[in-house]
Amino acid sequence: IWELKKDVYVVELDWYPDAPGEMVVLTCDTPEEDGITWTLDQSSEVLGSGKTLTIQVKEFGDAGQYTCHKGGEVLSHSLLLLHKKEDGIWSTDILKDQKEPKNKTFLRCEAKNYSGRFTCWWLTTISTDLTFSVKSSRGSSDPQGVTCGAATLSAERVRGDNKEYEYSVECQEDSACPAAEESLPIEVMVDAVHKLKYENYTSSFFIRDIIKPDPPKNLQLKPLKNSRQVEVSWEYPDTWSTPHSYFSLTFCVQVQGKSKREKKDRVFTDKTSATVICRKNASISVRAQDRYYSSSWSEWASVPCS
Amino acid sequence: RNLPVATPDPGMFPCLHHSQNLLRAVSNMLQKARQTLEFYPCTSEEIDHEDITKDKTSTVEACLPLELTKNESCLNSRETSFITNGSCLASRKTSFMMALCLSSIYEDLKMYQVEFKTMNAKLLMDPKRQIFLDQNMLAVIDELMQALNFNSETVPQKSSLEEPDFYKTKIKLCILLHAFRIRAVTIDRVMSYLNAS
């Protein structure tokens, strides 16, 4: 058993049918010695008397808010949460496996640049009685500071019969140098509590591996005289690291017909312009990627050909 | 013509071209190592990230773009940097800093070259003959060193008398390739920046 925060405790249980559970001793936070009784949650049934209460915690029915009283007055509370270990592996009931980029990906994180700022998000089908708390650091043995905000509900969507809820959090490394070569990964730890169930999720990454630039901005077409060709031009996104000659991007320019089945023409360039043939009803899209370290491509920025 | 150390402009293109080749070569070699050594811990998540140049060279610091010298996090533990003189850089200081930067890159390349050659000698003794260093990558390191045109005493290749532990050597190869790829990215960024300056 360990303390999650003041008066909230997590009991770790080897979770299998007929498991013996864990013996837990609760102590009433009071100078009083006599006439103390204990109850669980809203029930008035007295579970025991005395300054300490010994309980065998086996299932969720044994978890909850234990309260010690004296003469009708509440002395203190202890909330017991359960953390299930199923055959050597901590349970992951609360969050959805996003399966991207690989199985057992519960937290996904992205950074728009090398400033040390990043966003993580996760999915759940649970809508109520749910709380998250997020901590982060650079490295784990001698951790360096990363500050995270509060996790917020960022999207809701319907998936088949189920509603899916997306939560996200923004974090910032306290002293980040964009040009630094990372040797210690960023660690992100999310504590999730649903009703009386506690779970924790972790992700470990280098900022360089989670880079996803914003789409190029100011995408414009300039028709070339006496030609079906157009000059496409764009600019680096405002959120990208500077100077751009050091933090260079490479670009992919795509001409896409109205029908998804039509052949796509693609050009790759390090410049911020390209000459392409603009077909009728087609659209031109441009996306960006770090020129030297192949992390994710940005989303597409698009303009119609007409 | 080889790069006269102090002047960034006309001769920078060959260095930029060579540094791009270097990044391509080390990335290909790393990919090959990860595929060939699939039963070894060779992914970025599994290896310890060690930098063999740590405390010996200071490429990131010496080659820091001027625009980042205002960022205090980039100035920690820095003996050398593009120190601003008022609002602009004195040209002699620029030349001096650039020389420091390029010589630091040269020293990096020399250290990695020695490590890779030593390692290749060990890998050639492996009865499994599972993996060897790409000769193209070694050649590209050499070409960039020549383009940088520094004279420095040759470091003797490390020779080891004890029987090599091939498992450890292959893991060391992965660690080395990951670190060298990150350094090659930095070198590419620096060359691109100097080329644009």
Epitope: D14, Y16, P17, K104 | -
Partner: antibody, heavy 115, light 112 residues
Framework: QVQLVQSGGGVVQPGRSLRLSCAAS????????MHWVRQAPGKGLEWVAF????????YYADSVKGRFTISRDNSKNTLYLQMKSLRAEDTAVYYC????????WGQGTMVTVSS | SYVLTQPPSVSGTPGQRVTISCSGG????????VKWYQQLPGTAPKLLIY???QRPSGVPDRFSGSKSGTSASLAITGVQAEDEADYYC????????????FGTGTKVTVLG
Amino acid sequence: QVQLVQSGGGVVQPGRSLRLSCAASGFTFSSYGMHWVRQAPGKGLEWVAFIRYDGSNKYYADSVKGRFTISRDNSKNTLYLQMKSLRAEDTAVYYCKTHGSHDNWGQGTMVTVSS
Amino acid sequence: SYVLTQPPSVSGTPGQRVTISCSGGRSNIGSNTVKWYQQLPGTAPKLLIYTNDQRPSGVPDRFSGSKSGTSASLAITGVQAEDEADYYCQSYDRGTHPALLFGTGTKVTVLG
């Protein structure tokens, strides 16, 4: 006393369907994940499927994906395996088992797919 | 396709020490716990070892398990006639959990 009692096995022709049941008692069935495991005659153990305690997630072996469906009725304390498009290679003893460091197995039920 | 490899058979005379190996990889045994089962002919498997080296109550102490790196082993010290059975190791793969990964199985024969 934890008990898993299986039923529903038998002889079936290729291409036909069969549903296996596993009735649980002696524990809070709705709190635990459950597996199906099979063993072809003279062969080793092969995992077939898993279902979470609340039925929210189901996992299948590639060999049965799209043909077998694992389900549970927590109000009846029963686990099911619906098998469709059966093949000769599905012939095996099928076991249900609880998920956890200590596990309990059903007695097994024989499924024979033969024309 | 079995990813956990066991020897097809091992044998010993009563009182001898018999060991069965179970070889896997970094993503299974290397990152997860191992169980061992005993299966007597015509019966369901019985748990012998859980969490690499733990014995459930009721399992004789002549059975012991261990794990090192990407391999595990089961030892029977002082093998007895009633130990003649099939033995299976089981683990998980970190990418496919909760799918059970079984070993190929080992037939233990007690001679004489």
